[in-house]
Amino acid sequence: MMTGTIETTGNISAEKGGSIILQCHLSSTTAQVTQVNWEQQDQLLAICNADLGWHISPSFKDRVAPGPGLGLTLQSLTVNDTGEYFCIYHTYPDGTYTGRIFLEVLESSVAEHGARFQIP
C-alpha cells in the first residue's frame, strides 16, 4: 500500500531571465527513493538516480543545474518556461509517486512565491 505524500513548492512565479529551484519532498513512507525524474509536460528535463547520479537532457543542459539535493534549478528563465513541472519519485517497494509544480515566468519585476501544497 502506498502511504507516502509528495510536498512540492506548489504554484510559483519567477522573473524572466532569473532562476528558480524546483523542489519536491516525499514523506510518510519508509520506501527507498531509487530515482527522481523531472519532467515538463511531455519533456524529460533530468533524472537523479540515487546511486548513478544525474542525467541532464541535452536540450536543457545549458539552463538546468542539478540540485540542491533531489531538486532541480532552472536558469535563464523565459516566458516559454511557464507551465507544469512534475517530479516523479521511483521508490521501492511502493512504486511511483508524482508531484506537480506550476511555474509562471513573469515579465515584470514582481514575482512572488505561491503557497506550498501537498499531493497525495
Partner: antibody, heavy 119, light 107 residues
Framework: QVQLVQSGAEVKKPGASVKVSCKAS????????IHWVRQAPGQGLEWIGG????????SYNQKFKGRATLTVDKSISTAYMELSRLRSDDTAVYYC????????????WGQGTTVTVSS | DIQMTQSPSSLSASVGDRVTITCKAS??????VAWYQQKPGKAPKLLIY???FRYTGVPSRFSGSGSGADFTLTISSLQPEDFATYYC?????????FGQGTKVEIK
C-alpha cells in the same frame, strides 16, 4: 585518449566465481560511472549494473543482485565486476562501459572479456 | 522492467539505401533512449543519445527521432561500413534495458 582495458578471457566451472577488471585511462575516473553489460553468444545486450566511483553508490539489475558485485579501486583507476555461483548460461562476453558526463548513455566501452562456464 | 522491442530483427539492404529501424518501449520513456552500433567481435559504439542527438564523430547520415514510446534510427544512405547490428537502450529507469538488436545485412 579515453581507454577502458579489460582483463583476459576466463574459463570457470559451474558454481565458481569470476572477477573481471576494467582499467580506465584518459579521463578523470571518479567523474564518471562505470557500467557492466554482458552479451551471451549470438544474443543481445544485458545491463548488469553501474558503480559511481565518486559517491561509492552502485545500482544493480535485480536479476544479478546477490550474485554480482561491482567495486572500484580509485588508486589504480580500475573497476571490477565479480559474478558468483556461475552457471552455464553466464557464458558471455562481459563489457565495462563509461557513462557520459551528466548523461546516462554509454560513450566508451572496453574490448570485452569472454567468460566461459563449463564443467 | 521496461521492454524495448526493435523491428525488424534483421534486414537486407544495398549500399545507398535508406534504412529505418524502429524501437518501441513498453511504457513512456520520454527521450531517454540511446542507439548503438555493434560489429562482430567488437564492443558497441554510441551513435545517438537522448533519442535525437548525434554523438561526436558519428556521420550525419545517422539520425534518431522519437519521444514517448516510439523511436526510430535512420541511415539516410547506407555505406559499406554500416553493415552491423544496431541496439536501442532506455535509461528512463533502472534496470536499463536494450532492444534485442537489428542486424543490417548486405543484399
Amino acid at each position: 585518449q579515453v581507454q577502458l582495458v579489460q582483463s583476459g578471457a576466463e574459463v570457470k566451472k559451474p558454481g565458481a566465481s569470476v572477477k573481471v577488471s576494467c582499467k580506465a585511462s584518459g579521463f578523470t575516473f571518479t567523474g564518471r560511472t562505470i557500467h557492466w553489460v554482458r552479451q551471451a553468444p549470438g544474443q543481445g545486450l544485458e545491463w548488469i549494473g553501474g558503480f559511481n566511483p565518486n559517491s561509492g553508490g552502485s545500482s544493480y539489475n535485480q536479476k544479478f543482485k546477490g550474485r554480482a558485485t561491482l567495486t572500484v579501486d580509485k588508486s589504480i583507476s580500475t573497476a571490477y565486476m565479480e559474478l558468483s555461483r556461475l552457471r552455464s548460461d553466464d557464458t558471455a562476453v562481459y563489457y565495462c562501459a563509461r557513462s557520459s558526463y551528466y548523461r546516462f548513455d554509454l560513450d566508451y566501452w572496453g574490448q570485452g572479456t569472454t567468460v566461459t562456464v563449463s564443467s | 522492467d521496461i521492454q524495448m522491442t526493435q523491428s525488424p530483427s534483421s534486414l537486407s539492404a544495398s549500399v545507398g539505401d535508406r534504412v529505418t529501424i524502429t524501437c518501441k518501449a513498453s511504457q513512456d520513456v520520454k527521450t531517454a533512449v540511446a542507439w548503438y552500433q555493434q560489429k562482430p567481435g567488437k564492443a558497441p559504439k554510441l551513435l545517438i543519445y537522448s533519442a535525437s542527438f548525434r554523438y561526436t564523430g558519428v556521420p550525419s547520415r545517422f539520425s534518431g527521432s522519437g519521444s514517448g514510446a516510439d523511436f526510430t534510427l535512420t541511415i539516410s544512405s547506407l555505406q559499406p561500413e554500416d553493415f552491423a547490428t544496431y541496439y536501442c537502450q532506455q535509461h528512463y529507469t533502472t534496470p536499463w534495458t536494450f532492444g534485442q538488436g537489428t542486424k543490417v545485412e548486405i543484399k
